[in-house]
């Protein structure tokens, strides 16, 4: 009874066509398959960064596989053949892996790497990215910005930077068509005439780092001798009214402070007939069913009643 | 040629301050930044912090943040170290450093001697 | 912050032995590490940087080799005047860190 052997993949390698972080992994079959013409080889693969606790494992039938990766680190990738139990007359027979690494060629030291980026996706509309320069820069390093997520043909370059004495400092965004729900990839590299620029990498997708505008139309109305309802409207723009969630602080006669959080454009506050003031702000946020996370709004403008009597009113500002 | 010519030993007392200098010439001081190192028993060596003569910028090990700050004298070329708060841990010597443009260090001070004791 | 793992800390060899020391990073750091030689009383001299490049004026006997976490020092040939203690440092990123030092003594 002979041992059933089977070759790894050959030709594996990690392929980077210039999208910023995603790349290829692709391999060749392996050689001597003659044995197993009527078998449908499959390959089992595992990639990482360079220093993550776990691997990624994807068992495929292709000669290939397409994932993002973080290109601040080295990327490293294994592969081996499995033959199914249907094709040995028993056990799964698996090859010995092969193995390939990949890493951008870094340059320059940490100290020429751009410090504190930030993105915003304001409103579900615009983005825009700014960044401090490297600690030990000066000011003939300008840094350019480069970004990709999937539906470009080809990574593009920022054309609207935010100076500041000469240098770029951020970036404002054209319109980014069908470019959230996905991973959008960002590189900021730079130029000096005396130094190389250390070059840092960016992924993150548009629906978690949105910033809605503020509600609106902020009103009273009293429900009852002891309730007042607080209206407001969604933010103009593009976002969902499903798609909210509310933060309002409430100040009742300078004193009383209180604060919650609503999934709808409403909330009824208990008072008593002494109140004699009452102002309230909301802030708006996307909630966890459009997005993982977000940013709070800016508060709104504050609405305020002052006054006697609110039983007979609805006070609109 | 490039020069790091840093201030003398010091002996203070627990509690006090100490600011030493790193007097430098040779090249254009604007053009690179100045790191601080410590070493302690002739042995074990610590990043202290980054600054950038050319606008004040500065970078710190969070280990001596708020107890060293980093300051530069254009006009003379000249980096200063300040520790405050100094206690026996202190005692060491400390040496400025300064990059190249692709790696650290190209040249050191010659270090100062700082030894805290009542 | 990223750990310098140093080994040994110290090793006697003889004139004209080989001599290695290693220097283990807690991450990646893409080949940004230096090798400093420092005698008694002076400050630290760069040997070696970016993992494997010489610095002009070092002896061709010292070099540097490893990538990703992993990275050695050689001394090909050791001679009296290489006695002193070897340090190295990650320049990956803030704060910068040294290995704890290898001391270098001629049988």
């Known amino acids: 009874d002979t041992e059933i052997k089977v070759n790894p993949p050959q030709d594996f390698e990690i392929v980077d066509p210039g999208y910023l972080g995603y790349l290829y992994l692709q391999w060749q079959p392996p050689l001597s398959l003659d044995h197993f013409k009527e078998c449908t080889v499959e390959y089992e693969l595992k990639y990482r960064n360079i220093g993550s606790e776990t691997w990624k494992t994807i068992i495929t039938k292709n000669l290939h596989y397409k994932d993002g990766f973080d290109l601040n680190k080295g990327i490293e990738a294994k592969i081996h053949t499995l033959l199914p139990w249907q094709c040995t007359n028993g056990s799964e027979v698996q090859s010995s892996w092969a193995e390939t690494t990949y890493w951008i060629s870094p340059q320059g030291i940490p100290e020429t790497k751009v410090q504190d980026m930030d993105c915003v996706y304001y409103n579900w509309q615009y983005l825009l990215c700014s960044w401090k320069p490297g600690i030990g820069v000066l000011l003939d390093t300008n840094y350019n910005l480069f970004y990709w997520y999937e539906g470009l043909d080809h990574a593009l370059q920022c054309v609207d930077y935010i100076k500041a004495d000469g240098q770029n400092i951020g970036c404002r965004f054209p319109y980014l068509e069908a470019s959230d729900y996905k991973d959008f990839y960002i590189c900021v590299n730079g130029s000096s005439e005396n130094k190389p620029i250390r070059s840092s990498y960016f992924t993150f997708q548009l629906q978690n780092i949105v910033k809605p505008l503020p509600p609106v139309y902020l009103t009273f109305t009293r429900e009852s001798s002891c309730e007042i309802k607080l209206k407001w409207s969604i933010p103009l723009g593009p976002i969902p009214a499903r798609c909210f969630d509310y933060e309002i602080e409430i100040r009742e006669d300078d004193t009383t402070l209180v604060t919650a959080t609503v999934e709808n454009e409403t909330y009824t506050l208990k008072t008593t007939n002494e109140t004699r003031q009452l102002c309230f702000v909301v802030r708006s946020k996307v909630n966890i069913y459009c997005s993982d996370d977000g940013i709070w709004s800016e508060w709104s403008d504050k609405q305020c009643w002052e006054g006697e009597d609110l039983s007979k009113k609805t006070l609109l500002r | 040629q490039v020069q790091l010519q840093q201030s003398g030993p010091e002996v203070v007392k627990p509690g006090a301050s100490v600011k030493m200098s790193c007097k430098t010439s040779?090249?254009?001081?604007?053009?690179?930044?100045m790191h601080w190192v410590k070493q302690t028993h002739g042995r074990s060596l610590e990043w202290i912090g980054i600054?950038?003569?050319?606008?004040?910028?500065?970078n710190y090990n969070q280990k001596f943040k708020g107890r060293a700050t980093m300051t530069v004298d254009k006009s003379s070329s000249t980096a200063y170290m300040q520790l405050r708060s100094l206690t026996s841990d202190d005692t060491a010597v400390y040496y400025c450093?300064?990059?190249?443009?692709?790696?650290?260090?190209?040249?050191w001070g010659q270090g100062t001697t700082v030894t805290v004791s009542s | 912050d990223i750990q310098m793992t140093q080994s040994p800390s110290s090793l006697y060899a003889s004139v004209g032995d080989r001599v290695t020391i290693t220097c283990k990073a807690s991450q990646d750091i893409k080949s940004y590490l230096s090798w400093y030689q420092q005698k008694p009383g002076k400050a630290p001299k760069t040997l070696i940087y970016?993992?494997?490049r010489l610095v002009d004026g070092v002896p061709s006997r010292f070099s540097g080799s490893g990538s990703g976490q992993d990275y050695t020092l050689t001394i090909s040939s050791l001679q009296y005047e290489d006695m002193g203690i070897y340090y190295c440092?990650?320049?990956?990123?803030?704060?910068?860190?040294f290995g704890a030092g290898t001391k270098v003594e001629i049988k």
């Open positions: 600054i950038n003569p050319n606008n004040g910028g500065t």
């Open positions: 440092l990650q320049y990956d990123e803030f704060p910068l860190t």
């Open positions: 450093a300064r990059p190249s443009a692709t790696h650290y260090f190209d040249y």
């Open positions: 040779g090249y254009t001081f604007t053009e690179y930044t």
């Open positions: 970016r993992a494997n």
